[in-house]
Interface confidence: medium
């Protein structure tokens, strides 16, 4: 006995895993299509099969799924200092990377740029620089970090957060000011 | 008649827990895969879980896998659903659904259970 209820009372339906609802007859459920693949017709019944086609050059689809087309693949942004890791295929979109000693910064969730890894001149290496960080430094003495890049502190102004790592260096320089209005 | 009777619902914090019941009755429980299907405000149905007939087997949708554990106890007639590390986008009323065939979709009665997931 398949339990059944009158339409007045049934709400809905919905298929599991790796199904779906066919668009014109909700009693159906059809196979989704294999990634690589896009749905071209609506299986005709129960048990037959979902009709799928390969995806075209320059399209893809990475899992498995009921859509009309395949999606067009990505563009590595060159002019943020982009690079082709691997090439879009049927099944997966393109891969985009740095190159060796950048590292990615994300202006947004789907958008990074390249940048050089800081060197940490006239520091040293705090952290080594990741695939989505840059190097973090820590300077020499008479150095402050500024834009993780070490600073003499020649260039240390009253106003800057440097004061406190720059202190005997600031008072050095106030002492020959004091010395010269006298 | 066909009846399943959702329950355990609540409100919960980001990361607590919860454990839904369904109580069948009107057909032969033990004969049939049942799931979990949810509605989140404003969308559509999603299938969340499913067991097999006997509990040997146990699917989940991704964003759920590693979180939520569904279970049946063919004795009382009740499927559960274990929510652990809740999250706001859990927030959806959820339907206990029986599974009648490979073909066919899952149907769901009740008035289901709401889980709002808030800090």
């Known amino acids: 006995l398949v339990p059944h209820l009158g339409d007045r009372e049934k709400r809905d339906s919905v298929c599991p895993q790796g199904k779906y609802i066919h668009p014109q007859n909700n009693s159906i459920c059809c196979t989704k299509c294999h990634k690589g693949t896009y749905l071209y017709n609506d299986c005709p019944g129960p048990g037959q099969d979902t009709d799928c086609r390969e995806c075209e050059s320059g399209s893809f689809t990475a899992s498995e799924n009921h859509l009309r087309h395949c999606l067009s693949c990505s563009k590595c942004r060159k002019e943020m200092g982009q690079v082709e890791i691997s090439s879009c295929t049927v099944d997966r979109d393109t891969v985009c990377g740095c190159r060796k000693n950048q590292y990615r910064h994300y202006w947004s969730e789907n958008l990074f740029q390249c940048f050089n890894c800081s060197l940490c001149l006239n520091g040293t290496v705090h952290l080594s620089c990741q695939e989505k960080q840059n190097t973090v430094c820590t300077c020499h003495a008479g150095f402050f970090l500024r834009e993780n890049e070490c600073v003499s502190c020649s260039n240390c102004k009253k106003s800057l957060e440097c004061t406190k790592l720059c202190l005997p260096q600031i008072e050095n320089v106030k002492g020959t000011e004091d010395s010269g209005t006298t | 008649e066909v009846q399943l009777l959702e329950s355990g619902g609540g409100l919960v914090q980001p990361g607590g827990s919860l454990r839904l019941s369904c109580a069948a009755s009107g057909f032969t429980f033990v004969k049939y895969s049942m799931g979990w299907v949810r509605q989140a405000p404003g969308k559509g149905l999603e299938w969340v879980s499913q067991i097999s007939d006997t509990a040997d087997r146990t699917y989940y949708t991704h964003s759920v896998k590693g979180r939520f554990t569904i279970s049946r106890d063919n004795s009382k007639n009740t499927l559960y659903l274990q929510m652990n590390s809740l999250r706001a986008e859990d927030t959806a009323v959820y339907y206990c659904?029986?599974?009648?065939?490979?073909?066919?979709?899952?149907?769901?009665w009740g008035q289901g259970t709401l889980v709002t997931v808030s800090s």
């Open positions: 659904a029986i599974y009648t065939g490979r073909w066919a979709p899952f149907e769901y």
